[in-house]
Interface confidence: medium
Amino acid sequence: QSSLTPLMVNGILGESVTLPLEFPAGEKVNFITWLFNETSLAFIVPHETKSPEIHVTNPKQGKRLNFTQSYSLQLSNLKMEDTGSYRAQISTKTSAKLSSYTLRILRQLRNIQVTNHSQLFQNMTCELHLTCSVEDADDNVSFRWEALGNTLSSQPNLTVSWDPRISSEQDYTCIAENAVSNLSFSVSAQKLCEDVKIQYTDTKM
């Protein structure tokens, strides 16, 4: 990747990621420098007849660093603080090739939940206020609500009116997704409204 447009790489929190390195064709590589947020991470000197010399210069990430045969960087047990800018400089006798990456650490989405605040009107129409959430959501998580394949909301929240006298049974599905995972959770309007109706008639007695 040219330094102008870094390759965006998604890593999953706690898992491993590889930043792929491409070599200049047919040129002998003198050394490779890997940088993280402009700070030296590792210095590699390849050898044709023996194992390469690898000098890890960042002790913080050092134990979690590895390199493939082609000197691509592998980072394991990813942490949120691994997010940032990575660069690899390949130096040959005649030139220096720069590869840039932006690593983004995303959480595998977990524990999708729907909370419901509903009310029953005197005309027996049920109004559902549904809120969808996932554990540790951030700005990279998008939510949407669907019913019968149609998008009803592009937010974690959905407000719908449901009339048991004229509406057929209806499921509403919340879909939460980020670049590495997606989750869905469906609720039945009929079931939710029946629950509200029971509460409503209980309190009226």
Epitope: L7, R104, N140, T151, S154, Q155, N157, T159
Partner: antibody, heavy 118, light 108 residues
Framework: QIQLVQSGPDLKNPGKTVKISCKAS????????MNWVKQSPERGLKWMGW????????TYADDFKGQFAFSLETSATTAYLQINNLKNEDTAAYFC???????????WGQGTTLTVSS | EVVLTQSPTTMAASPGEKITVTCSAS???????LHWYQQKPGFSPKLFIY???ILASGVPARFSGSGSGTSFSLTIGAMEAEDVAAYYC?????????FGAGTKLELK
């Protein structure tokens, strides 16, 4: 049918403030977030961010933090973009656009042309 | 941010000519999150093709979209006068959301 109607063109002096409105109709306003997009000849279409129309939470793109503010008048199904301390480079067309599912810009307002000049 | 590079920047085509506009992403994009917009002079952009290949309502069948990963394209089977416009690709999976710089299509 779904419509987004924006306020008219505006001419402002540098250092002043402008507030652009976007009136939504034809759908449940609080179910769909509202994006704001800037279009200029120099930089093309740039996403400024969006506001959650249910809880009012704005999200700003990095280039639009500080000087810009999104707000709502939910009862009037209207979203607002306020630009403070206007600069010449704020001269552009500004669009509101309704979010929808995996499509971020399903419906667009007609645009508001802002000219900043002394 | 993810950079979307469109080519060509400007293109003049004769009526009936087949046209292909490409959109190259600096990072792989799920096909569900790559969309195309058409903008005619003096108007706002309009959703044109969404999720890589689905034509928006009212879009003529001579248009099609395809692609995956980092390479996407919009094709017009046979250019017509009403197709004169700018076409923008847009990705919606990485924040910030980004647009290509646009391809301006003109009539020869």
């Amino acid at each position: 049918q779904i419509q987004l109607v924006q306020s008219g063109p505006d001419l402002k002096n540098p250092g002043k403030t402008v507030k652009i409105s976007c009136k939504a109709s034809g759908y449940t306003f609080t179910n769909f977030g509202m994006n704001w997009v800037k279009q200029s000849p120099e930089r093309g279409l740039k996403w400024m961010g969006w506001i959650n129309t249910y809880n009012g939470k704005p999200t700003y793109a990095d280039d639009f933090k500080g000087q810009f503010a999104f707000s709502l008048e939910t009862s009037a199904t209207t979203a607002y973009l306020q630009i403070n301390n206007l600069k010449n480079e704020d001269t552009a067309a500004y669009f509101c656009a309704k979010r929808g599912g995996t499509v971020d810009f399903g419906y667009w307002g007609q645009g508001t042309t802002l000219t900043v000049s002394s | 941010e993810v950079v979307l590079t469109q080519s060509p920047t400007t293109m003049a085509a004769s009526p009936g000519e087949k046209i292909t506009v490409t959109c190259s992403a600096s990072s792989p994009i799920s096909s569900n999150f790559l969309h195309w917009y058409q903008q005619k002079p003096g108007f706002s952009p309009k959703l044109f093709i969404y999720r890589t290949s689905i034509l928006a309502s009212g879009v003529p069948a001579r248009f099609s979209g395809s692609g995956s990963g980092t390479s996407f394209s919009l094709t017009i089977g046979a250019m017509e006068a009403e197709d004169v416009a700018a076409y923008y690709c847009q990705q919606g999976i990485y924040m910030p959301l980004t647009f290509g710089a646009g391809t301006k299509l003109e009539l020869k």
